[in-house]
């Protein structure tokens, strides 16, 4: 059974992941630069089901495409503090949260998503899991 300390650690990691995802989304939305709309031509894959930490496998598999899109966006006057480090940090948190012992094959939904829809989906996931822990 999970201890209160492990639950607290999980909660903190989820909050960190949530903040990182929100920072990316804010970087896209708050910049108020319609030039960045070309990022919206990129296609992201969404999980069929995302209700447990192990489903973060689906986020992990999309981190490389996310990094590529953010790198491309940099040339359009969009500045995130070191995209590579940010994605790397997210990856570390995701690996710890989902657990490396579970080798879940991600099941993707038929519908794809834009970068904004993708980030919103995983932000909602984090918020949902955090609420069950508190």
């Amino acid at each position: 059974a999970p201890t209160s300390s492990s639950t607290k650690k999980t909660q903190l990691q989820l909050e960190h992941l949530l903040l990182d995802l929100q920072m990316i989304l804010n970087g896209i939305n708050n910049y108020k630069n319609p030039k960045l709309t070309r990022m919206l031509t990129f296609k992201f894959y969404m999980p069929k089901k995302a209700t447990e930490l192990r489903h973060l496998q689906c986020l992990e598999e999309e981190l490389k495409p996310l990094e590529e899109v953010l790198n491309l966006a940099q040339s359009k006057s969009f500045h995130l503090r070191d995209t590579k480090d940010l994605i790397s940090n997210i990856n570390v948190i995701v690996l710890e949260l989902k657990g490396s012992e579970t080798t879940l094959m991600c099941e993707y939904a038929d519908e794809t998503a834009t970068i904004v829809e993708f980030l919103n989906r995983w932000i909602t996931f984090c918020q949902s899991i955090i609420s069950t822990l508190t």
Partner: antibody, heavy 122, light 108 residues
Framework: EVQLVQSGAEVKKPGESLKISCKGS????????IGWVRQMPGKGLEWMGI????????TYSPSFQGQVTISADKSINTAYLQWSSLKASDTAMYYC???????????????WGQGTTVTVSS | SYELTQPPSVSVSPGQTARITCSGD??????AYWYQQKPGQAPMLVIY???ERPSGIPERFSGSSSGTTVTLTISGVQAEDEADYYC???????????FGGGTKLTVL
Amino acid sequence: EVQLVQSGAEVKKPGESLKISCKGSGYSFTSYWIGWVRQMPGKGLEWMGIIYPGDSDTTYSPSFQGQVTISADKSINTAYLQWSSLKASDTAMYYCAREGFGESIHYGLDVWGQGTTVTVSS
Amino acid sequence: SYELTQPPSVSVSPGQTARITCSGDALPRQYAYWYQQKPGQAPMLVIYKDSERPSGIPERFSGSSSGTTVTLTISGVQAEDEADYYCQSADSSGTYVVFGGGTKLTVL
């Protein structure tokens, strides 16, 4: 009503210069990319390049880089396509088109001009 | 340079279903858009984001995507649907817009 209105048909001789226009109305012209598309007689659509009128940031198709110049004057909501020295092979219909977008979605080229016919012949 | 491949022509009888395909290596990661062009007219957007229909486009027009291929489907084809259809997307970097060669839809 959102629309793009292009300048009229042109007949030119090889070696002459030309500048055609595309005027936007009914929306914030500086906030949307405007692309130019060529269609040679009886052929398909070819993307030439795109401009962001807000700051004139421009991207050209590798096939058209150095062949044409795309520009914009945001004070009069107008984008331009120009040639410094026309060739017979530039004879075509040229369309301008707006790249549409919403808060989290890209609509593609959602508004098109009526097209400008350019004929280059000696 | 990046290319999108379409069949040059598709023929179908009125009331039947027409399917026009478009293939390209970047399509698993780049959305596709479809345009209809009738003789003497400017192209018109009929599908965006692989499968979404702009307002005013009849429900018989639909789009789908699978791997490196996207498909425009016109159900219950009508005589007025006879036109050239172009797919459009971007290269893998999202930098350059690319059109397919176009497909002439003939309604028999």
